[in-house]
């Protein structure tokens, strides 16, 4: 799943998503997570993985969304 | 023409509840979001909750409103706020305000009540 | 929690002038930032919403910019009618939905 790159690094929250995954992310394997920056051209919600990894979720999917209510309320 | 009316504030004592209510008129309830905010007198704005989400009916809640405020969606065109166990602190008027979901989430707030004041004291 | 720290609690100015506010997140709010005016005994009016986009009928004398954490309100031409409290607020959906303490701006 693709970010649009940046010279602050792969995690910088200015990164848009262009792609989604198509899987869910195991709960246990989520570290962090930030939205895409409000002047993208698409929406987009970046898991970042225990092993480092940042992947690009659709907002819309209920998965995600319960993921962040429940990170928010935790 | 879009507004929101709030009504219910009341002076009450405390340990007492207390039931809000904001109206909508001309005001989508299912493509919106809808908010508490409150400001106690001379001091600042506060949020206490939001109900978005259409038919699904999302809430949040300030960490420190939790399990004592509660919003709920009554009809189509009416949101109240449950107050329980007030105390001298949610002394301030209450505000219902309308924001914008961007993205399956709640933003700008763009429509905004006159507020109705709750009194807490003995 | 995101807290928004806003500065200064307080700015005074001449009509014609410019004013900065500033507001400051605990952790970056991605551009999710919205600044709302509030006159006394009115309720809050939305000024400025994805840091940077003015709200329908906010002229352009009123200026959001910034990223990342920081953020800042820029008034120019001041006015009379630009006395008021001026609050930002957090708009992400992976923070709590927290509001700045507030600036006035005091105009001579």
């Known amino acids: 799943t693709k970010t649009e790159s940046s010279s602050r690094g792969p995690y910088h929250p200015s990164e848009c998503c262009f792609t989604y995954t198509t899987y869910k992310i195991p709960r246990q394997r989520i570290m962090d997570y930030y939205e895409t920056n409000s002047q993208c051209s698409k929406p987009g919600i970046v898991f970042i993985t225990k092993r480092g990894h940042s992947v690009c979720t659709n907002p819309s999917d209920k998965w995600v969304q319960d993921y962040i209510k429940d990170m928010k309320e935790n | 023409c879009q507004s929101l009316e709030e009504s219910g504030g009341d002076l009450v004592k405390p340990g007492a509840s207390l039931t809000l209510t904001c109206i909508g008129s001309g005001f989508d309830f299912s493509s919106n979001a809808i908010w508490w905010v409150r400001q106690a007198p001379g001091k600042g704005l506060e949020w206490i909750a939001?109900?978005?989400?259409?038919?699904?009916?999302?809430t949040e809640y300030a960490t420190w409103a939790k399990g004592r405020f509660t919003i709920s969606k009554t009809s189509s065109t009416t949101v109240t706020l449950q107050m329980t166990s007030l105390t001298d602190a949610d002394t301030a008027t209450y505000y219902c305000a309308g924001g914008v979901v961007t993205w399956s989430y709640p933003r700008q707030l763009y429509l905004w009540g006159q507020g109705t004041l709750v009194t807490v004291s003995s | 929690d995101v807290v928004m720290t806003q500065t200064p609690a307080s700015v005074s100015a001449v009509v014609g002038g410019t004013v900065t506010i500033k507001c400051q997140a605990s952790?970056?709010?991605?551009?999710?930032l919205s600044w709302y005016q509030q006159k006394l005994g009115q309720p809050p009016k939305l000024l400025i919403y994805s840091a940077s986009t003015l709200a329908s009928g906010v002229p352009s004398r009123f200026k959001g910019s910034g990223s990342g954490a920081d953020y800042t309100l820029t008034i120019s031409d001041l006015e009379c009618a630009d006395a008021a409290t001026y609050y930002c607020q957090s708009n992400t959906a992976v923070h709590t939905y927290n509001f700045g303490g507030g600036t006035e701006v005091v105009v001579k």
């Open positions: 939001c109900l978005y989400g259409g038919t699904s009916g999302s």
């Open positions: 952790q970056s709010i991605s551009s999710w």
